[in-house]
């Protein structure tokens, strides 16, 4: 049997017995388009896809449209893997998503959906989620029913104002509503009472900007 | 560095008044929508009232209409509360805060709690005899 080469997403990486965590490279089916994705082969069972990460400032977040539809950063550190591949990869198959948060008193938190996925670019990436579970928020802090993406250069927000200009990041924003991960990163005693900061409301509150944010997904039925 | 400080509170008679007021700093309120919220013990934050950013119109809680009166001086970077007829059911701490003009969805007047990403550290209110 010929060994397979190339992997959809970490889950399968994982499968392959590759289990250490790191940066591989991952390739849709029928696609010849790779992408540099991390994977988290050790929490929660391992085969975790991260598609966001912040965790130092290091990254501008405050990028186009075409920057967050292709993915930008650096895999090892801070990045966003890529509104394209997410749409596509969630929409072969089902997947969910964890958030992991971290706040700058030691504390850690996530939120479980059972169910994720991204629409196409043509219907503006819009988030869909379901089933949410977690330490992080009872409610969730990603708006429901979910909405458009959003980039300072692309306003689908549901606002009389320009949400990810005034708030800063490319999100799924409301007008603008509960959480922003994407947000201007601030360092530890200067992230209270800050306007466009990386926000989940329901578990920090208004105004707290986290100290780190991990987006990762992994087939359901893993 | 953004701050709110809220100010005037105390100890006041069933039937009494108090002027809380809001000083913010690190940015002009010309540019902002300010809210008063309340919190009683066990209770969840509740809001009292609000002023908007463009227009001064202002918003009441049921509760507190009224007697209750928002206003705002831009030139001393302040809003107040002025609370007169002050019942026991009053008794909280208060909170000012403070969300960026036009954070707002289409069609709609007023903010939602979790706008407001500037907040105050409260003032206790006691109305008692």
């Known amino acids: 049997k010929e060994e397979q080469i190339s992997f959809r997403d970490c889950a399968e990486v994982f499968k392959s017995g590759h289990t250490t965590n790191g940066v591989y490279t991952l390739t849709l089916p029928n696609s010849t388009e790779e992408v540099k994705a991390y994977c988290d082969m050790e929490a929660g069972g391992g085969g975790w896809t991260i598609i966001q990460r912040r965790e130092d400032g290091s990254v501008d977040f405050q990028r186009t449209w075409k920057e967050y539809k292709v993915g930008f950063g650096n895999p090892s550190g801070e990045y966003w893997l890529g509104n394209e591949f997410v749409s596509q990869l969630t929409n072969q198959q089902r997947y969910v998503l964890k958030i992991h948060l971290k706040d700058w008193e030691g504390n850690e938190a996530y939120s479980l959906y059972e169910h994720f996925y991204l629409s196409s670019e043509e219907l503006n990436y819009r988030i869909h989620l379901k089933g949410l579970t977690g330490t992080a928020g009872k409610i969730s802090s990603i708006s429901q029913p979910g909405n458009d993406f959003s980039t300072k250069d692309a306003d689908n927000d549901k606002c009389i104002c320009k949400c990810s200009q005034m708030l800063t990041g490319g999100w799924w924003f409301d007008a603008c509503g509960p959480s922003n991960l994407n947000g201007m990163y601030y360092p530890q005693r200067q992230n209270t009472n800050k306007f466009n900061g990386i926000k989940w409301y329901y578990w920090k509150g208004s105004g707290y900007s986290l100290k780190g944010t991990t987006m990762m997904i992994r087939p359901a039925d893993f | 560095e953004v701050q709110l400080v809220e100010s005037g509170g105390g100890l006041v008679q069933p039937g009494g008044s108090l002027r809380l007021s809001c000083a913010a700093s690190?940015?002009?309120?010309?540019?902002?929508?300010i809210g008063w919220f309340r919190q009683a013990p066990g209770k969840e934050r509740e809001g009292v009232s609000s002023i908007r950013d463009n227009d001064g119109s202002t918003y009441y809680a049921d509760s507190v209409k009224g007697r209750f009166t928002i206003s705002r001086d831009n030139s001393k970077n302040t809003v107040y509360l002025q609370m007169n007829s002050l019942r026991p059911e009053d008794t909280a701490v208060y909170y000012c805060?403070?969300?960026?003009?036009?954070?707002?969805?289409?069609?709609?007047?007023?903010?939602?709690?979790?706008?407001?990403?500037?907040w105050g550290q409260g003032t206790l209110v006691t109305v008692s005899s």
């Open positions: 805060a403070a969300v960026p003009a036009g954070r707002l969805r289409f069609g709609e007047q007023w903010y939602p709690l979790y706008e407001y990403d500037a």
């Open positions: 690190g940015f002009t309120l010309d540019d902002y929508a």
